[in-house]
Amino acid sequence: TPKIVDLPDHIEVNSGKFNPICKASGWPLPTNEEMTLVKPDGTVLHPKDFNHTDHFSVAIFTIHRILPPDSGVWVCSVNTVAGMVEKPFNISVKVLPKPLNAPNVIDTGHNFAVINISSEPYFGDGPIKSKKLLYKPVNHYEAWQHIQVTNEIVTLNYLEPRTEYELCVQLVRRGEGGEGHPGPVRRFTTASIGLPPPRGLNLLPKSQTTLNLTWQPIFPSSEDDFYVEVERRSVQKSDQQNIKVPGNLTSVLLNNLHPREQYVVRARVNTKAQGEWSEDLTAWTLSDILPPQPENIKISNITHSSAVISWTILDGYSISSITIRYKVQGKNEDQHVDVKIKNATITQYQLKGLEPETAYQVDIFAENNIGSSNPAFSHELVTLPESQAP
């Protein structure tokens, strides 16, 4: 008669994929069809894989996702011409562990962080065999890095300065497939190297050839002498200049620039050690020519008393305002209405209070420090009758 061999009475498995094995001997050797596995709920499973040696048949079953409710008595069954044999065995399905809390950041420097991994309490089953601390920079397309940890307090080294990182903990229990899902994520930012940049930086055009950079007063925390280093470079040309400004000043005039050119400026506070650069600021010097006409002009949503006009403007011409001028078709030039939009970032305006059933001539032009653009063509606008929906 067949005989089931090497099957322990009790098996502990981790939830997830599970491949139980039934091994049997006997003559003739049991075939694929003659070996089954019966779950506690009575479901009969057939081998997904099968092989045999001279003395044994080995049936491999596949359960894609075994869960705690599947715990209980399973039965390996072999039924051949020589007879039938069954062997019950107990399976205990465990829940993979996952920390309930995110790790805590105790301390950070410019290249390290001290972390309390907060691995307990956790959801799921123990005992915990090992713990991993996973980390990666935010906004980087890098894979998670990890370190194995034994203590609750761990130091992460070799981090980048002034970089935001994400942290989480992964717990591993004994047995195959014992890696739990990573727990909640904590974000933190490493410190800067050197002094922080000046606060309240502001860059504004002063003239066609100058830009003015201002910042809040700097109060050093040590006795060391310090100065502000300002770097300016042209976006259009490969032209860069670094200027040293005494630490007691709160502004610098960047001169000898070119009209209608965009510059990028940044600043830092240096002592013996160099400080950390500020974010880039950009500004255009004032224009030396009239601005071009607004482009992409579109009049839409026309009703009996209103219409929406939209447009775009080109960067770099120091455009300070947009004027929409409209008048009834055929009326004198001086009988027009001017709408001045002083915020040049606005690109849409609703003309209101128009007369129904009236033809208007609409012009739109841009103004800068030199003057106004010259519209080549007027736009026609005919309001609808009050009864007519747009």
């Epitope: 033809a359 005919v382 309001t383 009758p385």
Partner: antibody, heavy 115, light 107 residues
Framework: QVQLQQPGADLVRPGASVKLSCKAS????????MNWVKQRPGQGLEWIGM????????RLNQKFKDKATLTVDKSSSTAYMQLSSPTSEDSAVYYC????????WGQGTTLTVSS | DIQMTQSPSSLSASLGERVSLTCRAS??????LNWLQQEPDGTIKRLIY???NLDSGVPKRFSGSRSGSDYSLTISSLESEDFVDYYC?????????FGGGTKLEIK
């Protein structure tokens, strides 16, 4: 001065889609709607649709929604109308016209659909 | 869609004569109406927009007017180049629609 240049004629086989062009000059192409109008031989005018080159917003006559596709190429200031699966019913003169109020018209392209 | 009924469909007149063409709108279109001229070679030109506004370069003998839902194009004194086709066009409501056209012929 404003000009809308259209090829004088085009011949297409039935079922083979055709793309008509309208090259604009003398004004800011991206600031005015462009209309397309159909005229069958000896008949009146029929509006197909319009497109605004700034953002390619398109408004189509429901009658032509499965027939006409309007596009623009801002770099060459050219408007296009593609007609799908043309039949003899699509043989006509096709005009482009500038602006929401049809202020300037192209010379028209005579499209002949014939095998 | 708004229907534009244009009359007459053809009209014979003499040089120097005063003529009027009419379009009637099936719904209220306010002043949202143009008059177009089409020459025998197919060239189309806008003569009048918004019912009564003369386009630049268009002779003063052309004028547009409105009475209720009836819109008129008047040519005060016909000249030889005026004997072509005329269409009205409404754009108050989408889709814009055209009148059936008037063929102006020399008597």
């Amino acid at each position: 001065q404003v000009q809308l240049q259209q090829p004088g004629a085009d011949l297409v086989r039935p079922g083979a889609s055709v793309k008509l062009s309208c090259k604009a000059s003398g004004y800011s192409f991206t600031s005015y709607w462009m209309n397309w109008v159909k005229q069958r031989p000896g008949q009146g005018l029929e509006w197909i649709g319009m497109i605004h080159p700034s953002d390619s917003e398109t408004r189509l006559n429901q009658k032509f929604k499965d027939k006409a596709t309007l596009t623009v190429d801002k770099s060459s200031s050219t408007a296009y109308m593609q007609l799908s699966s043309p039949t003899s019913e699509d043989s006509a003169v096709y005009y482009c016209a500038k602006g929401y109020y049809f202020g300037y018209w192209g010379q028209g392209t005579t499209l002949t659909v014939s095998s | 869609d708004i229907q534009m009924t244009q009359s007459p469909s053809s009209l014979s007149a003499s040089l120097g004569e005063r003529v009027s063409l009419t379009c009637r709108a099936s719904q209220d279109i306010g002043i949202s109406l143009n008059w177009l001229q089409q020459e025998p070679d197919g060239t189309i030109k806008r003569l009048i927009y918004a019912t009564s506004n003369l386009d630049s370069g268009v002779p003063k003998r052309f004028s547009g007017s409105r009475s209720g839902s009836d819109y008129s194009l008047t040519i005060s004194s016909l000249e030889s180049e005026d004997f072509v086709d005329y269409y009205c066009l409404q754009y108050a409501s989408s889709p814009p629609t055209f009148g059936g056209g008037t063929k102006l012929e020399i008597k």
